[in-house]
């Protein structure tokens, strides 16, 4: 019996330009003797329904159709074909097939492959136009894929040192396209720093599938009204 | 072994048209987005267009738009790019080439046809 | 419309020494590809997704960069690798390939 083992859970996800492998594992009922079976891995795109050859390997013969597509002939024998595509773009993401042939037996399997990118994130203070003690402080969310993203505001005093998070005066624009298909967004918090205990800190939190953990952007509140602090960037996507 | 073949130079006058052609060997040219890519003498590289030839679908650089036209023949596994209303600024080597799946990235190119315009 | 800036124009070396050539973009992008091209000849692929050699090129070449800024670096030249280098973006907003000027680099 020939069977083909996938990701569990039928989707990988990869960060953008890494060296990605989608894994495909062979059971068999027998040593494998990797002259006389074939490897074969497609892609069907997202955007264009088109299935193409990513790689194939047969016996002696194996070829890349995807400029540094490569599956190890030596992790091959102990069953393990899967690819590697080093530098992955967004554009590749879709539905990669690997299909295994020990003839006279055939045996395929498929995986969804997601390319996320993860956000940088950076806090602005905007105080044109604003009146005596309102500030507006806008949190950059830029670099971003897929589309989707979630900022929320926090603040913690010295009374309640625990996050809460805030609902008013904040305002999300809409997700902007950039050129190279990525993703920009701009929220913004608005402030009255008079009615504001000193020493309050503020948290610009950004939530997106790239991210294992939120990423986090902070100010205090001082006498002299505020202090910005670097992004705290926890750990990205790997 | 994968190859871009291209059609012979070409001397042609200015008002004319011209259809040059991109012969691929070692590949089907349906699992691949075909590009056209030009080159002045003595500058530098500038992107005409692609083509993708499982359906049909063109994208064209605005300066190209309305002028350059891309097609292929894929029983014969062919490109072809039609330049019509030629000037002496389109003196140029021009070149096919091939991008992979998603990766946009120019992996084959063919050896270029040089087409000069002139009266 | 994005537009790439390669810098210098024109670069001069002797063999063994280390060059770097940079490709700017007026936006932002995620990745870059580069081409090298001698008189005469098509160009080659050279580096794929900025850090990726394309098949056989030699190591001593490699690719960086993010955002805005690219940069190929040569570690030792040599005088074969004496050619125009061409970076290359594509962008899908809207879909356009684009690429830099070049960078020609000539052994002394």
């Known amino acids: 019996d020939l069977k083909v083992e996938m990701m569990a859970g039928g989707t990988q996800i990869t960060p953008l330009n890494d060296n990605v492998t989608i894994f495909c594992n062979i059971f068999y009922s027998q040593p494998l003797n990797i002259t006389s079976m074939g490897i074969t891995w497609f892609w069907k795109s997202l955007t264009f329904d088109k299935e193409v050859k990513v790689f194939e390997f047969f016996g002696d013969h194996q070829e890349a159709f995807r400029p540094g597509a490569i599956v190890s002939p030596w992790r091959l024998k102990s069953g393990d074909a899967s690819l590697r595509l080093p530098g992955i773009q967004l554009e590749e993401a879709g539905e990669y097939r690997c299909e295994v042939v020990v003839t006279p037996l055939k045996a395929q399997g498929t995986v969804q492959l997601e390319v996320v990118a993860s956000p940088a994130s950076r806090l602005l203070l905007d105080q044109v136009g604003m009146k005596e003690n309102e500030d507006k402080y806008m949190c950059e969310s830029s670099g971003f894929y897929p589309e989707a993203i979630n900022i929320t505001w926090e603040k913690q005093t010295q009374k309640f040192p625990h996050p809460i998070e805030i609902s008013e005066d904040v305002i999300t624009g809409p997700t902007i396209k950039n050129m190279d298909g990525t993703f920009n967004v701009t929220s913004c918090l608005k402030l009255n720093s008079s009615q504001e205990d000193p020493g309050t800190v503020y948290q610009c939190v950004v939530r997106h599938a790239s991210l294992h953990t939120p990423l986090r952007s902070n100010f205090t509140l001082t006498a002299a009204r505020h202090s910005l602090s670097e992004t705290e960037k926890t750990d990205n996507f790997s | 072994e994968v190859q871009l073949q291209q059609s012979g130079a070409e001397l042609v006058r200015p008002g004319a048209s011209v259809k040059l052609s991109c012969t691929a060997s070692g590949f089907n040219i349906k699992n691949t987005f075909i590009h056209w890519v030009n080159q002045r003498p003595e500058q530098g590289l500038e992107w005409i267009g692609r083509?993708?030839?499982?359906?049909?679908?063109?994208i064209y650089a605005s300066k190209f738009q309305g002028r350059a036209t891309i097609t292929t023949d894929t029983s014969s596994n062919t490109a072809y790019m039609h330049l019509s209303s030629l000037t002496s600024g389109d003196t140029a080597v021009y070149y096919c080439?091939?991008?992979?799946?998603?990766?946009?990235?120019?992996?084959?190119w063919g050896q270029g046809t040089t087409l000069t315009v002139s009266s | 419309e994005i537009v790439l800036t390669q810098s210098p124009d024109f670069l001069s070396a002797s063999p063994g020494e280390k060059v770097t050539m940079t490709c700017r973009a007026t936006s932002s992008l995620y990745s870059m590809h580069w081409y090298q091209q001698k008189p005469g000849s098509s160009p080659k692929p050279w580096i794929y997704a900025t850090f990726n050699l394309a098949s056989g090129v030699p190591a001593r070449f490699s690719g960086s960069g993010s955002g805005t800024s690219y940069s190929l670096t040569i570690t030792r030249v040599e005088a074969e690798d004496a050619a125009t280098y061409y970076c290359?973006?594509?962008?899908?907003?809207?879909?356009?390939?684009?690429f830099g000027a070049g960078t020609k680099l000539e052994l002394k």
């Open positions: 080439a091939r991008t992979y799946g998603g990766t946009n990235y120019f992996d084959y």
């Open positions: 290359q973006q594509w962008s899908t907003n809207p879909p356009k390939l684009t």
């Open positions: 083509i993708d030839p499982a359906n049909g679908n063109t």
